[in-house]
């Protein structure tokens, strides 16, 4: 007996061939001997089976002695043995229909779990193997689960169902809802305008939800909500904003925040959360602000940074075009009695300058000028 595997919702074509290459009488029946379809002269005839409106054939093949049974919009319960009667012969075909669906929505938040459930006909014992877009393989029986979804899990999952040495392939598109970056860091000189951007790693027709930016300033004992906003069909509207600092927010995606001035008291870490409508859980992106200040007071030239810096970052003070006068893995460096000229304060990581501030030191009889 020939075995054919089908996919729920798809169309399957079961073949039946006669030795005579001409249009002759044929009938297709199910295992209960109920007629599905056949031919009578120029007409296609249908029986009282439950497949009635979904069963078909292709008349163009009849003259070649081929009498297919086409079943559209397959259902699991279409799994059966189908019998083709032609030229006093009977051909049997066993059809097994499988379905593979994602547990809930195919749009899942980063860190959530994906469960794929296999629907199969009674008596079958299929095995399933799925390959994620990043090439990870998972195997299982009726259900397959992947916990802690990552951004790289977004895309087409290819799942192969194996039964009776035959296989059928399913493709399921999964969208992992996340920000493009889990964390970002912004380096600014004191007084500069700060731009924070929170691009999403997915696109959807309509995006609705609400969000908030909590800020933990390095100098503050507790965190503070800087801004709350709503998102409706990709349009951003501010609900509440602190007076200090008075953040501005872009009205369109990607989420964009502007801090008018980088000041030492704002240096620290923020956590932007976004709760999406009809989703449990929130999207998170961490953002860090490092602020640099170079000052000269009396005979002391000082360079300081505030905010979350890595211990391997180097802070240096150097006279332009000269070797560094002082270079330390600390958050403040200074030079006593600095020579006149343009001094540079540099924050660097393995030789790469992240932040630079220049200060002009005048001869001792005059006051300093900050460019």
């Amino acid at each position: 007996k020939k075995v054919v595997l089908g996919k729920k919702g798809d169309t399957v074509e079961l073949t039946c061939t006669a030795s005579q290459k001409k249009s002759i009488q044929f009938h297709w029946k199910n295992s209960n001997q109920i007629k599905i379809l056949g031919n009578q002269g120029s007409f296609l005839t249908k029986g009282p089976s439950k497949l009635n409106d979904r069963a078909d054939s292709r008349r163009s093949l009849w003259d070649q002695g081929n009498f297919p049974l086409i079943i559209k919009n397959l259902k699991i319960e279409d799994s059966d043995t189908y019998i083709c009667e032609v030229e006093d012969q009977k051909e049997e075909v066993q059809l097994l229909v499988f379905g593979l669906t994602a547990n809930s929505d195919t749009h899942l938040l980063q860190g959530q779990s994906l469960t794929l459930t296999l629907e199969s006909p009674p008596g079958s014992s299929p095995s399933v193997q799925c390959r994620s877009p990043r090439g990870k393989n998972i195997q299982g029986g009726k259900t397959l689960s992947v916990s802690q979804l990552e951004l790289q899990d977004s895309g087409t999952w290819t799942c192969t169902v194996l039964q009776n040495q035959k296989k059928v392939e399913f493709k399921i598109d999964i969208v992992v809802l996340a920000f493009q970056k889990a964390s970002s860091i912004v380096y600014k000189k004191e007084g500069e305008q700060v731009e924070f951007s929170f691009p999403l790693a997915f696109t959807v027709e309509k995006l609705t939800g609400s969000g908030e930016l909590w800020w933990q300033a390095e100098r503050a004992s507790s965190s503070k909500s800087w801004i709350t906003f709503d998102l409706k069909n990709k349009e951003v509207s501010v609900k509440r904003v602190t007076q200090d600092p008075k953040l501005q927010m872009g009205k369109k995606l990607p989420l964009h925040l502007t801090l008018p001035q980088a000041l030492p008291q704002y240096a620290g870490s923020g956590n932007l959360t976004l709760a999406l409508e009809a989703k449990t859980g929130k999207l998170h992106q961490e953002v860090n602000l490092v602020v640099m200040r170079a000052t000269q007071l009396q005979k002391n030239l000082t360079c300081e940074v505030w905010g979350p810096t890595s211990p391997k970052l180097m802070l240096s003070l150097k006279l332009e075009n000269k070797e560094a006068k002082v270079s330390k893995r600390e958050k403040a460096v200074w030079v006593l009695n600095p020579e006149a000229g343009m001094w540079q304060c540099l924050l660097s990581d393995s030789g790469q300058v992240l932040l630079e501030s220049n200060i002009k030191v005048l001869p001792t009889w005059s006051t300093p000028v900050q460019p």
């Epitope: 009578q40 002269g41 120029s42 007409f43 296609l44 005839t45 249908k46 078909d56």
Partner: nanobody
């Protein structure tokens, strides 16, 4: 009363084109798959093309595939057969019919003659 009325037949030169129409009435046309058949002179009736109720799926006799196009307009209760690159062997009476029996509906036919 169920009626299928074919029109658009006539005399055409080899290589020419014709468009046949079949006006349906007396039944729910949009629910039935339909067909075109022809009866060449002195021969039996042969099936040419099928179209499903929505117009999404079509099927053709090998000798007319690529030359003939079956289509339908459910809003106008009309079935069409566009015939291009006509040959002398396409001569005959053309009939529209329901694809299935039941209901087994037939039209009265329209004559197509391909001759130079």
């Amino acid at each position: 009363e169920v009626q299928l009325v074919e029109s658009g037949g006539g005399l055409v030169q080899p290589g020419g084109s014709l468009r046949l129409s079949c006006a349906a009435s007396g039944f729910t046309f949009s629910k039935l798959a339909m067909s075109w058949h022809r009866e060449p002179p002195g021969k039996g009736r042969e099936w040419l093309a099928d179209i499903d109720s929505s117009g999404d799926t079509t099927d053709y006799l090998a000798s007319v595939k690529g030359r003939f196009t079956i289509s339908r307009d459910n809003a106008k209760n009309t079935l069409y057969l566009q015939m291009d690159s006509l040959k002398s062997e396409d001569t005959g009476v053309y009939y529209c019919a329901s694809r299935e029996d039941p209901p087994g509906y037939w039209g009265q036919g329209t004559q197509v003659t391909v001759s130079s």
